[in-house]
Each structure stands twice: as structure tokens, then as C-alpha cells.
């Protein structure tokens, strides 16, 4: 059975009724977040390996909406929810409080002010 | 403006009204082609860097629907159309008549009987 996916912003990727877009321009985490917000979206939130299995094949490194809260040592998403255990393998290449998404559900810790490409997501 | 994408088979990726699916199981080119056909689709056809720019971020190597015609030395798609110039960078890693898609619009020549993952595509 075939079905429609969305709705999504024009020319975004639609998968399992979520919308994704990969942006080529390099911005720091805060600028990336602002860019997504201006498009009525947020930086990528990884919430399910099954529902988001397209992400396992993503090449390179891209800002996602995950930030480190130094006061309690946790990682949380822009919406305030805590990173679920076993969803991402967190890798600390350097000190930082923001995270880049990399293929196969890995999160690379990075300084939030470093420019990187980014992934926006809109949940429908 | 937001819009719906598709229609596509359930749980396929929809992008610019084309449907894509990445299959994890390794099959040779012929088995991969048969798998796509059984789902009313074909192996990936690359026809536009603009309309298919999601492909630039694909990690790893996957069978696509491109085959070498030894009699005239050309590369053509399953539908018989000839590979357009400048669409793919063809890289001859070894002797073969089938091609794997790799990120940034590269095609790697491979023996058709070698098992690989594959990408199916359905144009709406």
C-alpha cells in the first residue's frame, strides 16, 4: 500500500511522517538552531533507531539539537527531554557542550561555537 | 508552504516526489534488481544532482541501476537510457559491468555478482 508523507516544507525529506533537511552552509550551534527555528523546525532530535533508521546512512558530521548540561552531567534535547540510554554512542573528541550527529547513531561532542553543517527536523 | 510527498510505499523515504529505500541485506546486482522490481520499483537511477541532492550525503556503497554495455562501451540505466555526462564520477576499482552508488555522486565499478546493499527508487 502506498501513502503520502508529510506535510513537510517544500523540498524537505519526508520519512515516517517526519521532515528532515540537511543544510550545507556551516554555522555554529546557535546559528544552526536559529536557522531551523526560522523554518518552523528544530535541530535534529534522535528519538528512535527504528523510526529514524535513515540516519544510519548519513555521511559526515552535522549539528543536532543535543546539548550538555554541565550542572547535572546529562545530555538533553532542545525541547528539554533527556537523551534516552543506548540511542546514541557519545564520543568526546574534545571538550564541548554541543553534539554533532554522525552515521550509525553516533554523537560527537564539539565546541558549540565551531561552524558545522546541520540537520533540521520537523515532526508532523 | 508545506506539502505532502508521494505517494510512496509504506516507510520509504520521499524526496521531491521520488521514493527511495535503502536495503541492508547484501545481494548481487541481479538479486537487488529483482528485489526492487518485486516492490514495483527499480534500482536507483541518478538523473539530477539538484533533484536528488539528498544522495550526496549517503554513506557507504550500494547497488544502483547502472550497467556497462560491453558492445558499445556505454553505461546505461535499467530503463535503457544512457548515463548523462557529468552526473556521476565513474571510478573503476576493479573489472565489472555494474556500478555501486557512493556519496557525492560517485559510481564505483564492481563485479555484478558481488553482494552489496542496494537502493531502490520509485518515481511518482
Amino acid at each position: 500500500t502506498e501513502s503520502y508523507c508529510g506535510p513537510c516544507p517544500k523540498n524537505w525529506i519526508c520519512y515516517k511522517n517526519n521532515c528532515y533537511q540537511f543544510f550545507d552552509e556551516s554555522k555554529n550551534w546557535y546559528e544552526s538552531q536559529a536557522s531551523c527555528m526560522s523554518q518552523n523546525a528544530s535541530l535534529l532530535k534522535v528519538y528512535s533507531k527504528e523510526d529514524q533508521d535513515l540516519l544510519k546512512l548519513v555521511k559526515s558530521y552535522h549539528w543536532m539539537g543535543l546539548v550538555h548540561i554541565p550542572t547535572n552531567g546529562s545530555w538533553q534535547w532542545e525541547d528539554g527531554s533527556i537523551l534516552s540510554p543506548n540511542l546514541l554512542t557519545i564520543i568526546e573528541m574534545q571538550k564541548g557542550d554541543c553534539a554533532l550527529y554522525a552515521s550509525s547513531f553516533k554523537g560527537y561532542i564539539e565546541n558549540c561555537s565551531t561552524p558545522n553543517t546541520y540537520i533540521c527536523m520537523q515532526r508532523t | 508552504t508545506e506539502s505532502y510527498c508521494g505517494p510512496c510505499p509504506k516507510n520509504w523515504i520521499c524526496y521531491k516526489n521520488n521514493c527511495y529505500q535503502f536495503f541492508d541485506e547484501s545481494k548481487n546486482w541481479y538479486e537487488s534488481q529483482a528485489s526492487c522490481m518485486s516492490q514495483n520499483a527499480s534500482l536507483l537511477k541518478v538523473y539530477s544532482k539538484e533533484d536528488q541532492d539528498l544522495l550526496k550525503l549517503v554513506k557507504s556503497y550500494h547497488w544502483m541501476g547502472l550497467v556497462h554495455i560491453p558492445t558499445n562501451g556505454s553505461w546505461q540505466w535499467e530503463d535503457g537510457s544512457i548515463l548523462s555526462p557529468n552526473l556521476l564520477t565513474i571510478i573503476e576499482m576493479q573489472k565489472g559491468d555494474c556500478a555501486l552508488y557512493a556519496s557525492s555522486f560517485k559510481g564505483y565499478i564492481e563485479n555484478c555478482s558481488t553482494p552489496n546493499t542496494y537502493i531502490c527508487m520509485q518515481r511518482t
Epitope: 550538555h68 547535572n72 552531567g73 | -
Partner: antibody, heavy 120, light 107 residues
């Protein structure tokens, strides 16, 4: 000032459990995580596990089946328990504070250590 | 697990000399390396974090450098109180691991 004070038995019978308490002062367990590390002549320093300020834990996979770390924030105490000890678990056991820098583990203050001998 | 190899096992220097400790990781770990000093019968003490960042209260003669797989701790002008074991530790990924240590001796 920041201090971590450890208390626990020096001698443990083979197959028995080890319990150590780490009592902290100069900082709050609701804000800082606490790591556990042991040191033996044979294996050097080995990271065992951590309890985060929020109460969740992460363990070294080599010890996950017999290790438990818990805490009581109001008493400023962290509790370490390891079961089924054998002679090769003889070591000095340390608690240490996880600094705010980075995610995983910069240990900026350490307890005095608890020397544990496993013997009958 | 990430292995950390420290060399040499023992360093013997004269007071006032500059000394360097090496730590090599089995894979690239960026700058996620930290250095500790442990004096005889004492607990480890943090000297350097994230390869090169200094720690409040640690004498300025201690410094660190490196990234990727090769890291160095240096003491510029060794003093007798520096007699100790020195360990590197990585925080790139679980489990956290330590090097086997280098013992500093004074001639």
C-alpha cells in the same frame, strides 16, 4: 573545601561482597557526578563506573554484572557495592569527583582510597 | 576499549631539568586526554585536562600538548617534590581507560 572521605572494610572473604561509602563535602551530589576507580599492581588504574548527579549510572562492561553504585544526596553519600569478589579484586578503591568540564570523565578531586584485600 | 601506552616506564632526571612523558592512544581521541600525578601512598591528583588545559593550583612548570593519538606531559624544571607516578587517562568514550604510568625518579 572539596573533600571525598571513604569508609569500608579492609578485608573481604572470597565470593563475598564489598561495600564502600564515599562521603563528600564542599560540593553537592545534585550537581556533580562521582566516579569509582580501582588500582592494583597487576592491572594499574581501572575505571569501574560513575553515578551522575541526576542519579543514573554507567558501568564498565567488565564489571556491570556485579557492580552497583547508588547515593543519598541529602546525606552527601555515595555507595559502592561489588559482589562475588575474588583474589584478583584486591586493590585500592577510589571515589573521585567528575568535574564540570566535558562529558565523560575529568576527575578533579579524589578520595583517600580504601585498601581492599580479598582473602580467606 | 581504547588502550593508552605510556613511555618510558621509568624516567630518571636531575633537578632543574626539563622532562617529558609520552602517552599514545590506540585510536584518535582528539584532545580528550588528562594527566594525573600520584605520589607514594597518595591519591591521584589532576595536573592537566584536555591535553593542554592548566589546572588551578598546579605549578606552571607542568604543561601538556598533543592531539589525535600522541600526547606529552612536560615538567619544565623538575623539583624533588615531583617524584611520583604520572598517568594519562582518556575520556573519548566508555570505558574510561588509563595508561600504565611512568615513574619519575630524581638522580
Amino acid at each position: 573545601q572539596v573533600q571525598l572521605q571513604q569508609s569500608g572494610p579492609g578485608l573481604v572473604q572470597p565470593s563475598q561482597s564489598l561495600s564502600i561509602t564515599c562521603t563528600v563535602s564542599g560540593f553537592s551530589l545534585t550537581i556533580y557526578g562521582v566516579h569509582w576507580v580501582r588500582q592494583s599492581p597487576g592491572k594499574g588504574l581501572e575505571w569501574l563506573g560513575v553515578i551522575w548527579s541526576g542519579g543514573s549510572t554507567d558501568y564498565n562492561a567488565a564489571f556491570i554484572s556485579r557492580l552497583s553504585i547508588s547515593k543519598d544526596n541529602s546525606k552527601r553519600q555515595v555507595f559502592f557495592k561489588m559482589s562475588s569478589l575474588q583474589a584478583n579484586d584486591t586493590a585500592i578503591y577510589y571515589c573521585s569527583r567528575k568535574s564540570h568540564d566535558g562529558y565523560y570523565g575529568v576527575m578533579d578531586y579524589w578520595g583517600q582510597g580504601t585498601t581492599v584485600t580479598v582473602s580467606s | 576499549d581504547i588502550q593508552l601506552t605510556q613511555s618510558p616506564a621509568i624516567l630518571s632526571v636531575s633537578p632543574g631539568e626539563r622532562v617529558s612523558f609520552s602517552c599514545r592512544a590506540s585510536q584518535s581521541i582528539g584532545t580528550s586526554i588528562h594527566w594525573y600525578q600520584q605520589r607514594t601512598n597518595g591519591s591521584p591528583r589532576l595536573l592537566i585536562k584536555y591535553a593542554s588545559e592548566s589546572i588551578s593550583g598546579i605549578p606552571s612548570r607542568f604543561s601538556g600538548s598533543g592531539s589525535g593519538t600522541d600526547f606529552t606531559l612536560s615538567i619544565n624544571g623538575v623539583e624533588s617534590e615531583d617524584i611520583a607516578d604520572y598517568y594519562c587517562q582518556q575520556s573519548n568514550t566508555w570505558p574510561l581507560t588509563f595508561g600504565a604510568g611512568t615513574k619519575l625518579e630524581i638522580k
